[in-house]
Amino acid sequence: YSNFRKSVDSTGRRQYQVQNGPCSYTFLLPETDSCRSSSSPYMSNAVQRDAPLDYDDSVQRLQVLENILENNTQWLMKLENYIQDNMKKEMVEIQQNVVQNQTAVMIEIGTSLLNQTAAQTRKLTDVEAQVLNQTTRLELQLLQHSISTNKLEKQILDQTSEINKLQNKNSFLEQKVLDMEGKHSEQLQSMKEQKDELQVLVSKQSSVIDELEKKLVTATVNNSLLQKQQHDLMETVNSLLTMMSSPNSKSSVAIRKEEQTTFRDCAEIFKSGLTTSGIYTLTFPNSTEEIKAYCDMDVGGGGWTVIQHREDGSVDFQRTWKEYKEGFGSPLGEYWLGNEFVSQLTGQHRYVLKIQLKDWEGNEAHSLYDHFYLAGEESNYRIHLTGLTGTAGKISSISQPGSDFSTKDSDNDKCICKCSQMLSGGWWFDACGPSNLNGQYYPQKQNTNKFNGIKWYYWKGSGYSLKATTMMIRPADF
């Protein structure tokens, strides 16, 4: 009798048992126990998965597969030799000991073994194919990795060279900046020195100009006095000649009063025969204190003492109480004569005030007050005006009755605000009122909708900042 049994031993290896009469043949087939199960991330004897992420792992696995393949190959060779050897012996025994019908069983066993061998061979072929496939993929991957690595290396090299270039450039620029800083410092120093020199020069020139102005005024005065003296002498000579030629003449001496050399205002200068507009020295009433003023000897008969002038914004009119009291600026350009002088002057005689205005469109207008005076400092130089005529509005743009004078540091207005700070400049602010000729100077095309400009409401309306203004006074009886 014979039978054929397939089973698994305690170690999990497959075994084939052939029972043939008293003889029992056991075949132990090799297991690919190094191969991982299909639950593993890398399947064995299954559809090829993506290449592993870890290159080292792939290499290791490839080596294991190669070892298995080698083992299987060796075992097959041993099995072949074993079968051949044993088959020879068995065949001899069979021929010797076994009857005819056992040949069939042996053929069956042989066939079975051959089938198993074929199956094992197929399996090995599959494994070989997989291994080849995997090897090819790994080779490709290695190639790609190599290419990628080369690219990265190239990029790194490029970047390194770029960085080096940038560093060189940076160093070059840093050096350039340092050089420029050095040059700049030198230039600054040089400019500072030049500035200092220029300032010294300017101050020298200013003092020279002042001296020249004084000399000019003195010369002008002297010249006019000489002309007047010459004129008087001529008259005296003529009168003497007349007297001498007259039969009833008595010898007499012409007694002349001493020439006036100090003037309280420009009207006196004009009456003395000096009729050219310019800067003259005036003397405070009942005092020897002097002040320089611009005398307008042309407008409306001349003799006007200019107390304020604006024309180009070259002088800052946002000044202190003291500055407005004593005066500031240049009589040749923009200036404020001084509240104290004007107060003293207008407190002794009756004066008229003329205000001349120019807009940016080429128009001119004026306001004339037939009585003007300023109260003393104890009354904050309050302004008093009556009798308005002129072309710059029928209503006075200086609030009536007159307001106290206010500056940025002396708030005497009637506003809950501080008008001088809000509108800029010192003025007879009300709350704040329709005018401010000492406001911020604005150039053309920037002179409308201004809250702090040079304002004369009843001529140009609100927010219009004027181009030029002049305030001048003259005795009412001139």
Partner: nanobody, 129 residues
């Protein structure tokens, strides 16, 4: 640069309504009072209404009380004049103007016209049937 731009004027029948807008730029309404003025042909410019303190204080001329309402939207820097029950005598060019809110005489609530230093170009309102 301070700018005021009026809009919303037009032709309206007597009894009708109009809403004027005054868009302000270059200043903030928090610090300024805005007034509406009007000038009819051949007449002096007159004050109509004014607003300050974010609408906390408003002023109306007697001739428009109960008919006109002034309001402001500080987020848009715009002041409005809602005019209802319009009459032919309301026909005029309407201007808006600005004045620093603090420029007030002690004891007074509103500002003389000469204190308004920034003005718009005006918008014409015609009330006619």
């Amino acid at each position: 640069e301070v700018q005021l731009v009026e809009s919303g004027g037009g032709l309206v029948q007597p009894g009708g309504s109009l809403r004027l807008s005054c868009a302000v730029s270059g200043i903030t309404l928090d610090d300024y009072a805005i007034g509406w003025f009007r000038q009819a042909p051949g007449k002096e410019r007159e004050g109509v209404s004014a607003i300050r303190d974010n609408g906390g204080s408003t002023y109306y001329a007697d001739s428009v009380k109960g008919r006109f309402t002034i309001s402001s939207d500080n987020s848009k820097n715009t002041v409005y004049l809602q005019m209802n029950s319009l009459r032919p005598e309301d026909t005029a060019v309407y201007y808006c103007a600005a004045v620093p809110a603090g420029r007030l005489r002690y004891g007074e609530q509103w500002y003389p016209i000469y204190e308004y230093d920034a003005w718009g170009q005006g918008t014409l309102v015609t009330v006619s049937s």
